[in-house]
């Protein structure tokens, strides 16, 4: 197991998850850790505890390894980091990778007030309700935006969007969370259509690949609950 020595360390590796950082309960996920060509061992940590290791074969000169989680559950949802060793030195820790399990327990209801088709500039509020009491609700927009909003609430939360712009149009879903990394089933999608303005088009952007499997978000939220602009479709945490 890795020994902490702060004196001499190698650059931190990059960690990411495929196909997504949001994984349906029971499904598999790959966690990739990219270090150096010379790495002799990679170690994966989960919530600060040693989780897995891989020793690349010398014959295969690779600078990354894949850790496979065969069945995602609430017990494997949380924060992952990785390290690598080259010679006698260990790297610094990668940035944290936050894996969320979805598809737990119950399905929330999502609706929009005053209606799903509104005029540019109109005030819109999303409501998410879940019979099972949860601590927090998340509202996510498919594609087109990397913003997640979260609100605390017992069985219902409201998400005021303010006066809407064309950027607000699209398809939304909400989740109830039992903790930050264990979420309910997704709600049925609600598509917000914006009419009026110069480009008079009420069509929401269509994308054949737009589905939960293609969502990627960095789940760090600021105090207001609105996500910082730091999502990548490959969820590569690097900086």
């Amino acid at each position: 197991q890795r020994i902490n020595t702060e004196k001499e360390t190698l650059p931190k590796p990059i960690i990411w998850a495929k196909p997504s950082i949001m994984v349906t309960n029971g499904n598999s996920v790959n966690i990739w850790c990219q270090g150096a060509q010379s790495a002799s061992e990679y170690q994966l940590y989960f919530e600060g505890s040693f989780f897995a290791l891989e020793r690349p074969k010398p014959s295969r000169s690779m600078n990354k390894v894949r850790f496979f989680i065969s069945q995602m559950t609430s017990h494997t949802a949380g924060i992952y980091t990785c390290f690598y060793q080259s010679g006698e030195l260990w790297s610094k820790s990668s940035n944290p990778l936050k894996l969320v399990v979805t598809g737990l327990y119950d399905t929330p209801n999502l609706w929009v007030y005053p209606r799903p088709e509104v005029t540019l500039g109109e005030n819109v509020t999303f409501f998410c309700q879940l019979k099972t009491a949860t601590s927090k609700f998340f509202l996510l927009k498919e594609r087109g935006s990397n913003h997640i909003q979260n609100k605390y609430g017992n069985i219902q939360a409201e998400f005021p969007m303010g006066p809407v712009t064309r950027a607000h149009r699209g398809t939304y879903r909400c989740f109830g969370s039992y903790n930050d990394y264990a979420w309910s089933f997704p709600s049925e999608p609600v598509t917000l259509l914006i009419t009026g303005g110069v480009e008079n088009s009420s069509l929401a952007p269509t994308d054949p690949t737009s589905s939960l499997d293609y969502w990627e978000f960095d789940l760090s939220t600021n105090e207001s609950g609105l996500q910082k602009d730091s999502a990548f479709w490959d969820h590569t945490t690097q900086n």
Epitope: A52, E54, V65, F68, S70, H75
Partner: nanobody, 127 residues
Framework: EVQLVESGGGEVQPGGSLRLSCAAS????????MGWFRQAPGKEREFVAA????????YYADSVKGRFTISRDNAKNTVYLQMSSLRAEDTAVYYC????????????????????WGQGTLVTVKP
């Protein structure tokens, strides 16, 4: 579906040896990473040893390093734990576990990674 059945437990004197076996049913054994865990009375389950699916990579808890050896026979769908120089503190129920499927040479140390577990076999070390 994978079923794991441990055997080989029993009572042994300090300094003695035992070999535990874990027989796996199903055709997926060759693609499974395997591990041994143990749980002493009143304590949490702890990692003992693990082996990658390709046989040639192993990892041990510091407490058993140099005394225990994990191995596997993919032809027999069996993983083994050879235990020697046994101590009183090795007394526990020993569980075999599998990660099915897996890739590469992943070795899993954390119990949460394992998706199949055996019922356990009791090892008692006493004079």
């Amino acid at each position: 579906e994978v079923q794991l059945v441990e055997s080989g437990g029993g009572e042994v004197q300090p300094g003695g040896s035992l070999r535990l076996s874990c027989a796996a049913s199903g055709r997926t054994f060759a693609s499974a990473a395997m591990g041994w865990f143990r749980q002493a009375p009143g304590k949490e389950r702890e990692f003992v040893a693990a082996i990658s699916r390709s046989v040639d990579d192993t990892y041990y808890a510091d407490s058993v390093k140099g005394r225990f050896t994990i191995s596997r026979d993919n032809a027999k769908n069996t993983v083994y734990l050879q235990m020697s120089s046994l101590r009183a503190e090795d007394t526990a129920v020993y569980y075999c576990a599998a990660v099915v499927p897996t890739y590469g040479n992943n070795i899993y140390v954390h119990s949460a990674a394992y998706n199949y577990w055996g019922q356990g076999t009791l090892v008692t070390v006493k004079p």
